[in-house]
């Protein structure tokens, strides 16, 4: 969470904005809120990214105004202008790429003042795992799958009977290029597993860490997922 | 000097639908939202919904939201707020008012009576 | 929606004194709330918006103040065209919501 002031002659604008992930070839959002203003028509709010020239957007007069925008943005922002009303200047990116990484800056001018900060946009890649049992190996076994990462992530596998085991040694775990060529499919099988157990296979990196929970018993199979964005807020 | 004006008191039958005007300034709306706030006797300020024509935008409450319809004419500067199937609870006072986020200027009320 | 409460809900307090109201919102609006007065027969007045920002032509014994989900109107020196209804209004996030208002009489 960062906050900004500004000052225009004796008034100043509150602007906080967090920090966020994206997830490319994803649509991603770039968060900004200000102090709300009646006057809508002297809202403007810019977002520029370190190291380039030119906007990322422009909006003013009630518009967009894309006429400065940098090519590398091009047909890729928005901002919620409903939302504009109650001080939400939020960017909407389209198709996160990884070169879209970068220190943003949220700057916001209204009738009161005007303000800015700035926030850290990381991207990579991160997905849900789905774990399932192996019926088809020599022992029964979990085979954990997410099928989008970027960076290669650290995978662990943890249980609840046995709090604390390093499950390195009878644990697999590979990593698969998919066809565009930066993210990665990420499978992990866990062998010897026993019955009326959870097992929790956890993927993490430096933008997202997943958990995927796997109950098994004699009549049924529970499963669990969770996602969470890391340096987030 | 902001002045909102709107159309007058009306009796009107469950069922039917209902219409009311407000006319602004031109520096009103272009520059500002318009929210239309209603309020039953004895009870407290109902947001309903507001426009924002500089911005194109439409917003309801969810307990409106499928039976009002809020509208701007840029041309004449009026903004409409139309209710349909009308009930005995939709009966009170209905303010247009220059804002969100908050309301700096209201319009004089128009009191609508819902009645068989 | 954001659900917005006000205490008390009537208040007698004598001329000359001073009244505090509060309002509560259900999760946090930060700054962005405003108060009205409302007299029976008219449309409501904007007094403060952001909290404690006086709007125009507001005198400077009714002050604002809070954060975050409690707030306070604050008139003092109550004079005899302040007693109406007060209530608060949070504009966070859509949908706008009002408080049911405060009851201010003379005592």
């Known amino acids: 969470l960062i906050i900004g002031f500004g000052i225009s002659g004796k008034h100043f604008i509150t602007v906080t904005t967090f920090t966020s992930a994206g997830n490319i070839g994803e649509d991603g959002t770039l968060s900004c809120t200000f102090e709300p203003d009646i006057k809508l028509n002297g809202i403007v709010i810019q977002w520029l990214k370190e190291g380039i020239k030119g906007l990322v957007h422009e909006f003013k007069e009630g518009k967009d105004d894309l006429s400065q925008q940098h090519e590398m943005f091009r047909g890729r922002t928005a901002v919620f202008a409903d939302q504009v009303v109650v001080g939400n200047a939020s960017l909407r990116l389209k198709n996160v790429q990884l070169t879209d990484a970068g220190t943003y800056t949220c700057y916001i001018r209204t009738s009161k003042g005007k303000g800015n900060a700035n926030l850290e946009y990381k991207t990579g890649a991160f997905s849900m795992p789905e774990i399932n049992v192996d019926y088809n190996a020599s022992s029964e076994s979990l085979r954990c799958e997410a099928p989008r990462w970027f960076p290669q992530p650290t995978v662990a596998w943890a249980s609840q009977v046995d709090q604390g085991a390093n499950f390195s040694e009878v644990s697999n775990t590979s990593f698969e290029l998919n066809s565009e060529n930066v993210t990665m499919k990420v499978v992990s099988v866990l062998y010897n597993v026993t019955i009326n157990n959870t097992y929790s296979c956890m993927i993490e990196n430096d933008i997202a860490k997943a958990t995927g929970d796997i109950k098994v018993t004699d009549s049924e199979v529970k499963r669990r997922s969770q996602l969470q964005l890391l340096n987030s807020g | 000097q902001v002045q909102l004006v709107q159309s007058g008191a009306e009796v009107k039958k469950p069922g039917s639908s209902m219409r009311v005007s407000c006319k602004a300034s031109?520096?009103?709306?272009?520059?500002?939202?318009i929210s239309w706030v209603r309020q039953a006797p004895g009870q407290g300020l109902e947001w309903m919904g507001g426009t924002a024509p500089i911005f194109g935008t439409t917003n309801y409450a969810q307990k409106f939201q499928g039976r009002v319809t809020i509208t701007a004419d840029k041309s004449t500067s009026t903004a409409y707020m139309e209710l349909s199937s009308l009930r005995s609870e939709d009966t009170a006072v209905y303010y247009c008012?220059?804002?969100?986020?908050?309301?700096?200027?209201w319009g004089q009320g128009t009191l609508v009576t819902v009645s068989s | 929606e954001i659900v917005m409460t006000q205490s008390p809900a009537s208040l007698s307090v004598s001329p000359g004194e001073r009244a505090t109201l509060s309002c509560r919102a259900s999760?946090?609006?930060?700054?962005?709330l405003a108060w009205y007065q409302q007299k029976p027969g008219q449309a409501p007045r904007l007094l403060i918006y952001g909290a404690s920002t006086r709007a125009t032509g507001i005198p400077a014994r009714v002050s604002g103040g809070g954060s975050g989900t409690e707030f306070t109107l604050t008139i003092s020196s109550l004079q005899s065209e302040d007693f109406a209804v007060y209530c608060c209004q949070q504009y966070k996030n859509w949908p706008f919501t009002f408080g049911p208002g405060t009851k201010l009489e003379i005592k």
């Open positions: 008012a220059r804002g969100g986020p908050y309301f700096d200027y």
């Open positions: 031109e520096d009103t709306f272009s520059s500002y939202a």
């Open positions: 999760q946090s609006v930060s700054s962005n």
